[in-house]
């Protein structure tokens, strides 16, 4: 039975040209995290594997940095980076947990972070 929950940074906004940290945290389970995949809509951004470490997709190597922790740092943001991001936690024995973050990249200097929320 899957008892865990994923807490994410929720709906966030950031300035064009700036950076943002995407963070998810799995709690309420003793399952072993074997891998975390980060995806932007239908594109793989990065993978953090417990044994192999980080793999950053070649097309994002210049703008994506691993961490902190299991999170992901996006740099040199453009308006095209606006959209949904997913953290996919592969665990044993529970299976897969998915968290969602919506990032809005703003032209203006008014960029506020949204509230944290939980996805069961």
């Amino acid at each position: 039975m899957m008892t865990g929950t994923i807490e994410t940074t929720g709906n966030i906004s950031a300035e064009k040209g700036g950076s943002i940290i995407l963070q998810c945290h799995l709690s309420s389970t003793t399952a072993q995290v074997t891998q975390v995949n980060w995806e932007q809509q239908d594109q793989l951004l990065a993978i953090c594997n417990a044994d192999l470490g980080w793999h950053i997709s070649p097309s994002f190597k210049d703008r994506v940095a691993p961490g902190p922790g299991l999170g992901l740092t996006l740099q040199s943001l453009t308006v095209n980076d606006t959209g949904e991001y997913f953290c996919i936690y592969h665990t044993y024995p529970d299976g897969t947990y998915t968290g969602r973050i919506f990032l809005e990249v703003l032209e203006s200097s008014v960029a506020e972070h949204g509230a944290r929320f939980q996805i069961p």
Partner: antibody, heavy 118, light 107 residues
Framework: EVQLLESGGGLVQPGGSLRLSCAAS????????MSWVRQAPGKGLEWVAS????????YYADSVKGRFTISRDNSKNTLYLQMNSLRAEDTAVYYC???????????WGQGTLVTVSS | DIQMTQSPSSLSASVGDRVTITCRAS??????LNWYQQKPGKAPKLLIY???SLQSGVPSRFSGSGSGTDFTLTISSLQPEDFATYYC?????????FGGGTKVEIK
């Protein structure tokens, strides 16, 4: 240099058994998921089974479930495929492959031929 | 199960030609799509992983694109050593499935 070397193939009668081995070298075997993929003569590729590096996930194709068993011995850097109740349609070249990040098969062995015939 | 449909099943082309092979999944597989090249009597070789990432050591004339259900492998300028059979494969969910293959032959 990453190397995968399959062995154990051969001619077996229908209903018989074989155990294939895949000896791995050149990488930290226990860190990688591994898969078996087969190819019948003149046909395409068919996934058979996969096993995670350390956590206990194992997956099988429906066509072999209950007859084949995938296993690994990380101390020997070896992957196995125990094949029981073999059928003529199991005739194929069997490849082992390394699967980084449970995603893509980046290195393959040379294959071992299994022929099931009376 | 996710079905992978490749087209064409075979094609004839000349050295220097631009070749495009398509692969369609029966449901969305995000970018969990890989491409392999196989020559007769040899093991498959990984060309492209995660839909568009070029495997180390593979010539840059190979490229992949697509996401969701529709994917493309492109060889920008066909070389003599590229005549082979190409397979797509989804790793979105088990059972892992391959396309039926595309045989690229010399015209």
């Amino acid at each position: 240099e990453v190397q995968l070397l399959e062995s154990g193939g051969g001619l077996v009668q229908p209903g018989g058994s074989l155990r294939l081995s895949c000896a791995a070298s050149g990488f930290t075997f226990s860190s990688y998921s591994m898969s078996w993929v087969r190819q019948a003569p003149g046909k395409g590729l068919e996934w058979v089974a996969s096993i995670k590096g350390s956590a206990g996930y194992i997956y099988y194709a429906d066509s072999v479930k209950g007859r084949f068993t995938i296993s690994r011995d990380n101390s020997k850097n070896t992957l196995y495929l125990q094949m029981n109740s073999l059928r003529a349609e199991d005739t194929a070249v069997y490849y082992c492959a390394r699967v980084p990040y449970d995603y893509w098969m980046d290195y393959w062995g040379q294959g071992t031929l299994v022929t099931v015939s009376s | 199960d996710i079905q992978m449909t490749q087209s064409p099943s075979s094609l004839s082309a000349s050295v220097g030609d631009r070749v495009t092979i398509t692969c369609r999944a029966s449901q969305s597989i995000s970018s969990y799509l890989n491409w392999y090249q196989q020559k007769p009597g040899k093991a498959p070789k990984l060309l492209i992983y995660a839909a568009s990432s070029l495997q180390s050591g593979v010539p840059s004339r190979f490229s992949g694109s697509g996401s969701g259900t529709d994917f493309t492998l492109t060889i920008s300028s066909l070389q003599p050593e590229d005549f082979a059979t190409y397979y797509c494969q989804q790793s979105y969910s088990t059972p892992l499935t391959f396309g039926g293959g595309t045989k690229v032959e010399i015209k």
